[in-house]
Structures are given as structure tokens and as C-alpha cells.
Interface confidence: low
Amino acid sequence: AITEAREEAKPYPLFPGPLPGSLQTDHTSLLSLPHTSGYQPALMFSPTQPGRPYTGNVAIPRVTSAGSKLLPPLAFKHTVGHIILSEHKDVKFNCSISVPNIYQDTTISWWKDGKELLGAHHAITQFYPDDEVTAIIASFSITSVQRSDNGSYICKMKINNEEIVSDPIYIEVQGLPHFTKQPESMNVTRNTAFNLTCQAVGPPEPVNIFWVQNSSRVNEQPEKSPSVLTVPGLTEMAVFSCEAHNDKGLTVSKGVQINIKAIPSPPTEVSIHNSTAHSILISWVPGFDGYSPFRNCSVQVKEVDPLSNGSVMIFNTSASPHMYQIKQLQALANYSIGVSCMNEIGWSAVSPWILASTTEGAPSVAPLNVTVFLNESRDNVDIRWMKPLTKRQAGELVGYRISHVWQSAGISKELLEEVGQNNSRAQISVQVHNATCTVRIAAVTKGGVGPFSDPVKIFIPAHGWVDHAPSSTPAPGNADPVLII
């Protein structure tokens, strides 16, 4: 496609010069005469048109091998200096030079902004030889130009170790404004000022910016890009975008949502994962964060008991993981549990409360009045005790654990017996004679084994001794257990 071409210099009148193939043979006029006429349209070049005097890089005149004739300086002919076209159009431009035939192996390379253009570019070089000179036309074409094609293009020719450089051809690809910075989504505090930035470039310049809030323009007068919009505060969510205008038209940025930070929504789905006698492991699903990161959470625990004083225990924890092990609870108790979380704005409401229970605990006291005596005729030891005064939280008594340790010279042996909850006495076989038997008893519930009673010792004599006196734990509050032998 032929594109709009505009020169920065004044255009020349149209000159219908001879076509390639009927080249001028007057070398002097061809290479070094000052310009007389010859407008050079952007996409049409004739190698025979005289160029305007060249002030750039030229090859110095050389003496021929015969030494009889000076050759004039070599220079690329002037061509269009500035091509302006719209994005996605095609463009073709060229540079031309006439080279005396005494120079061999001339090649032309294209350069853009100081870098050689290699590879898959549409560059074509055509040679039109005559008796003494060869006209060379190097064409460069770009299909569907983009902004990245903007720049200064030159031809270079190496000849006898000299470098000849053409005038630059500046390609300016114009299009709709292109955003280099668009507004970003933000979460802001209510009624607090914030800035949004929008920047767009051409060409063509200038680019003017209008700001849009919720589909309505905010500024009546456009601002030159870049533009910073200072919003002194919002009370509700808004969507902002910016419009960039230039002579080619309008581009609209993405719309960005400006959210107003608020307190979080309450957590949901509070769940019980594990209960023990004195702890409950809970988890929850966080609510909406109110456009501000969670900072921490608070687990609130109320005992559900008509006799409790209704106080709330509060346990603070980090916002993640969304789990917490509540400790220091009473055994076999019912609790109501809620969770609240906070962000920089404040605390959420409490989640829906859930009910949870701790399991039975182990007994907290040992059986009382433990007595032990030897029944020699049966070769066993009788043990008696009183049921401990366990609290409700310890749960239901399931039995007792009896520990008896037998010690004689060089021997120590511990045995454990389990008896049912209805018993308050037990008999154990004598394991060793001429030895000491130490007895301790603990109450057992589903929650575990309680503390053992203080030890009661009895001496088991060798066969033949008779002693029926019992050993017993003292009444509560007394000193060490008494051993009677």
C-alpha cells in the first residue's frame, strides 16, 4: 500500500526522469553536480535523478589507476526524510547511489537506530549497470507497520574500506494512544485520599487524559499525559478508568475497582476436630476480609452451666492457620464457642456460636483409708480401701488399679492388678516370702487413671510366722503411712 509521506524539507517539483536502463553517462553530472530539480516521491526513485549536494559521509575522490582522472565523491542521493503513516499500513522506502564501475563488490546494508537489520527483513537491492557507472537502488519494505518500526533508517555501503552513509529516513508510525501506565486497583480507607496514575504515548503527541469514575467523566478539561488523579476520599466502591486521546482517536484503559476497606465478615463453619478432658481443637472458615488482610483472631469460650458465672474466656491467636486448640478447660463440661477476626479497620462480628464438650477427666484424688494385712493361711494379702470422693468432671468410676511391689534381698518386682468399680477390697497372692510388699491404689475412669494413694508396706515373713496385724494408710491429713509387722 502506498502510504502518506511527508518530508520535513520543502518538496521538489515532480521530475519525470529517465527510467533505469537509460542511465546518464556524464559521470560528473551524475555524481557531483549540485541539485537542479527532482522531487523524490516516497516510493518512487529513479537512479538517474540528480541528488541534492550531500553533506554527510562520502568517499573521498580517488585517482584512477592510469592516474589521469579524478573521480568525484560518492554519496547516496537524498531521499524522503520523514515518512508518517498509520499503524498496520505497508511502507516501502529506498536509497540510491551511482557507483563507478571501477569499484567492485559493493554491498548495501540497512541500519535502524544504529543497529544493522539482519535476517528476515524485506530488503531488496537492484543494480542497473552502464558502461562506466552502476546505479544501485536498495529498497526496504515493511508490511503492517507497528510502533516498534518507528525509528531512523539509513543505508550503508562499504567501498574500498570507506563507509558511505545515507541521510536518515525517519519512519513515524502513528496510532491510537498506547498506555504505558494504567491505574491500578486499590483497597483504600473510607474518606482517605489516594492517587491514581495514567500515562499514554503516541505518536502522534500530545496525548490528553480524561478520568472516568463509574462511567462518568471526572474532569471537564483534559490533562496532558501523564496525569495523576488525587481522589480525596470515597465512601463506597468506585470504578475508575482513564481515556487517552490524540489526533488518531481514543483508547480507554482498563477499569479498576477501588474498594473501601471495612471490618471483616464473621467467620463461618466453626468445627470441632478433637476433644479431650481439658482441651478442644477447633477450626473455622474465615469470612470476607473487608479488603484488608486479617491480623488476628479471637476465640471466645463460654461455659454452658447454670451454675457458672457466665464469664467468657478469650484466647487470641494468629489469623492463620484457621485452627486453634483451646486449653485449660474443665473436664466433662459443655462450652459455647465463637470466633471473631480483625483487620486494620476493626473486629468482625462473632461467628455463629457452636456447642462443644470436653470428655471425662481422670480422677483427681486417690482412694482413702487403704489397709493391708497378711492372710497367712491362704498365703495371700488382703487389701481394703474407701471409694474416693471424685468430682463430677472425672466421670464415672470404672475400677481401680492396684500396684504392689515386692522387695527382698536383691529382688524388686512390681505387679499391677485391675479390679471393678464395685469392689472396695482385693486379695493378691504372696509373691515372695521374707520380703516387703508395698501397695498403692488409684481410681480409674474413662478419662484415665487418677493419682495413686500413698504407699502402704507390709512385711511377708518366712513360712511359719503368724502376724495378722494390718497395715494401713493414715486418715487424711496425717503423717507418713504406718507399717505394722
Partner: antibody
Framework: QVQLQQPGAELVKPGASVKLSCKAS????????MHWVKQRPGQGLEWIGM???????NYNEKFKSKATLTVDISSSTAYMQLSSLTSEDSAVYYC???????????????WGTGTTVTVSS | DIQMTQSPASLSVSVGETVTITCRAS??????LAWYQQKQGKSPQLLVY???NLADGVPSRFSGSGSGTQYSLKINSLQSEDFGSYYC?????????FGAGTKLELK
Amino acid sequence: QVQLQQPGAELVKPGASVKLSCKASGYTFTSYWMHWVKQRPGQGLEWIGMIHPNINTNYNEKFKSKATLTVDISSSTAYMQLSSLTSEDSAVYYCAKRSPYSNYDWYFDVWGTGTTVTVSS
Amino acid sequence: DIQMTQSPASLSVSVGETVTITCRASENIYSNLAWYQQKQGKSPQLLVYAATNLADGVPSRFSGSGSGTQYSLKINSLQSEDFGSYYCQHFWGTPLTFGAGTKLELK
């Protein structure tokens, strides 16, 4: 030139409501925020809130349950309804247009003539 | 909310004198301040915006200054038409708030 026309006076009974109007002319109504300001006799100025015909409303928390701002774009008129009126609501109510100098500079280059609301049985 | 404290509450002055009215904000308002004049029974009129800029048609004897939290309005060589009430107003976020006003009376 830019004008904001308001009726001169309204007499209303306690507990009733009143709807004040502010007719704009001389500028693009849909491009500017319209603000409402209260002035009790012999007192200072209190900002009630503002409305943008295409964007949203923004109220002073103090007046949120008292005032409701609306617009009729077809007639370039802004309205403020005041509800559950008491003697405390007796005042001059002004509408005011924000200045065109920049986007969010909420000061007022044009004020309405003001409507005097008297709440009396 | 940002509080605007204006002083003095009233001022008795003669024609030709110079007066200064001050306004203090409860926090930094970054020069987002306007001054208005109101005459008895009339609507307020904008005098100064953005702390220092004179509104269209305002005589040059009026000038605004200040930054941060402290602002002032100065009237040089007071004229008879300058008597009335003066209000400052911040526009650094909402709610917008006004000073309580300064009443300028003829001595």
C-alpha cells in the same frame, strides 16, 4: 451564566417531610457534583452531602438519616428531601456547585439563593 | 472528622485597616482550603481556593496563605463592602467542614 435557582421559603409542620429543589442552568449538569449546605439562623455553615448525577451520593454521617439527595437529569434539577422535621431543622438550605478548577476540589464557586425552611405547628 | 477552628469570632475594624483571619485544621489538610465571604441575607461567595489562589473577580486586596494545619486570610485596606462574615472550609476528604465564622463589623 451559571445559576442555581431555589424556592425562597417552605413552612412545614413538625414530623412532616419536605423536598427542596435546586434548578441548574448555564453548565453541563451531569459533569459536576452538587452539594447541599445548611445554615441555622445566626450560625455557621454545615455540609450535608453531595450528589453526582452519574456517579453516586456522599453524605455527612450526621445527616444520613435526615437527608436524601436525588437528581432529575432531564430537568437539570437536584433535590434534597428532609424527613421527620423538628425545630432543629429550621434553617436556610443552600445548594452549591463545585468549582471547575480541578477534579475533586470540593469548594463552591456558585451557590443557590437558599431556601428558608421553617418548622412550626 | 476534620475540625476547623477559626479565630477571631468577631472583629470591629475601620475602613482602610488591614485584618487577618486565621483558621486551624485538626490535621494536615495539604492546602485543601477555601475562604468564603457572606453578607447578611445573601449566599456565600468564594474568595480563595487551594489556600492561596484568588477566585475570579475577587479584588487583589484579599490574599490567602498557609500550609499544613495553619491558614490565614488577609484583607489589606479594608473597604466598606468587605464587612460581613468570613468562613474557611477544608476539602481534604469528606465530610467537608467549615470554620465557625468570623464576623467583621464596622467600628
